[in-house]
C-alpha cells in the first residue's frame, strides 16, 4: 500500500515538473512572440514613416519621369559597375528614347562635364549585335558610334552627346537607373 502511494506521489511530482517545464516554455514563447511583435511593429512603423516621407528617388539620385538615375563618383570596369548598381537595387542605365538621352547628357553637363560613363549596353561577341542588359535591342538612333577596335568584349558608354563603345575592361564612371516610386497620394 505504502509502495503504491509512493509511486503515485512520484508520478504526480513528475507531472508537476512537466507542467512547470511547459509553463516555462510557454512563457519563453510568449516573450519571444512579444519581442517579434514589437520588432514587426517597429519595422512597419519605420516602413510607413519612410514611405510617408519618401520622395520618388533616393538621396543623390536624379528623377526624370518614371526613372531615377545615379551618376557614380568612382571609376570601375563595366562588370563591376553593373554589380555596383545591383547593390543599390538598380541596373546600368538603359536609354529608351532620344528624349531620355537628351535628359542624361544635359544632366551630365551640369554635374560633371565631359567624362565617360558606362551604360547597360554590350556587344554580343558572336553576332556583333548590340543589346541592352535586359536582352532588348537599342532603337536604331541609339547605337554606339563604332570606335572600339578591341578584340575583347565591347561595352557602351556615354560621353558628351554621344553613345560610344570601348573595351569593357577600361575604367569609367557609370550611371545606374531604377524605377521611381509612385506616389500613392
Amino acid at each position: 500500500k505504502l509502495l503504491q502511494v509512493s509511486t503515485i506521489a512520484m508520478q504526480q511530482q513528475e507531472k508537476l515538473i512537466q507542467q512547470e517545464r511547459a509553463l516555462l516554455n510557454f512563457t519563453e514563447w510568449k516573450r519571444s512572440c512579444a519581442l517579434q511583435m514589437k520588432y514587426c511593429q517597429a519595422f512597419m512603423q519605420n516602413s510607413l514613416s519612410s514611405a510617408h516621407n519618401s520622395s520618388p528617388c533616393p538621396n543623390n539620385w536624379i528623377q526624370n519621369r518614371e526613372s531615377c538615375y545615379y551618376v557614380s563618383e568612382i571609376w570601375s570596369i563595366w562588370h563591376t559597375s553593373q554589380e555596383n548598381c545591383l547593390k543599390e537595387g538598380s541596373t546600368l542605365l538603359q536609354i529608351e528614347s532620344k528624349e531620355e538621352m537628351d535628359f542624361i547628357t544635359g544632366s551630365l553637363r551640369k554635374i560633371k562635364g565631359s567624362y565617360d560613363y558606362w551604360v547597360g549596353l554590350s556587344q554580343d561577341g558572336h553576332s556583333g549585335r548590340w543589346l541592352w542588359q535586359d536582352g532588348s535591342s537599342p532603337s536604331p538612333g541609339l547605337l554606339p558610334a563604332e570606335r572600339s577596335q578591341s578584340a575583347n568584349q565591347v561595352c557602351g558608354y556615354v560621353k558628351s552627346n554621344s553613345l560610344l563603345s570601348s573595351n569593357c575592361s577600361t575604367w569609367k564612371y557609370f550611371i545606374c537607373e531604377k524605377y521611381a516610386l509612385r506616389s500613392s497620394v
Epitope: 519595422f43 545591383l86 547593390k87 543599390e88 537595387g89 538598380s90 541596373t91 542588359q133 535586359d134 536582352g135 537607373e177 531604377k178 524605377y179
Partner: nanobody, 116 residues
Framework: QVQLQESGGGLVQPGGSLKLSCAAS????????MGWYRQAPGKQRELVAA???????TYADSAKNRFTISRENTRNTVHLQMSSLKAEDTAVYYC??????????WGQGTQVTVSS
Amino acid sequence: QVQLQESGGGLVQPGGSLKLSCAASGSIFSFNAMGWYRQAPGKQRELVAAITDGGRLTYADSAKNRFTISRENTRNTVHLQMSSLKAEDTAVYYCTIWTKDRQQYWGQGTQVTVSS
C-alpha cells in the same frame, strides 16, 4: 543572418533545359536585388542574371535570349530558367542576394553539368 537554398541543378544533355530555384530565408524583409552567378572550373565567378526589387533585369551576354530570371510574388524566391544549354554552361551556379543594407550573401551553389 540570411540563408540561401539553391535547388534544380543536375546533368542535362546539350540543347536541354533546366530550372534553378533559390529561396531566401532568415532575417530578410526586402532586398535590393537577387541573382545568379556561375563558376566553371579554373574560371572566375561571373554574373549570369539578376533581378532588382523593382523588377529590372540584367543578363550576361552569354545568357541573353537563352536564360530567363524571374521572381515569385513572395519576393524571396528567384528562378533561373535555362534553355538551349551548351557544354560551356557547365559550372557551379550560385544564388546571391543584395540586401537593403547593401550586404551581399551567397548560397552554397548547385552543380549544372551539360554533357551527352
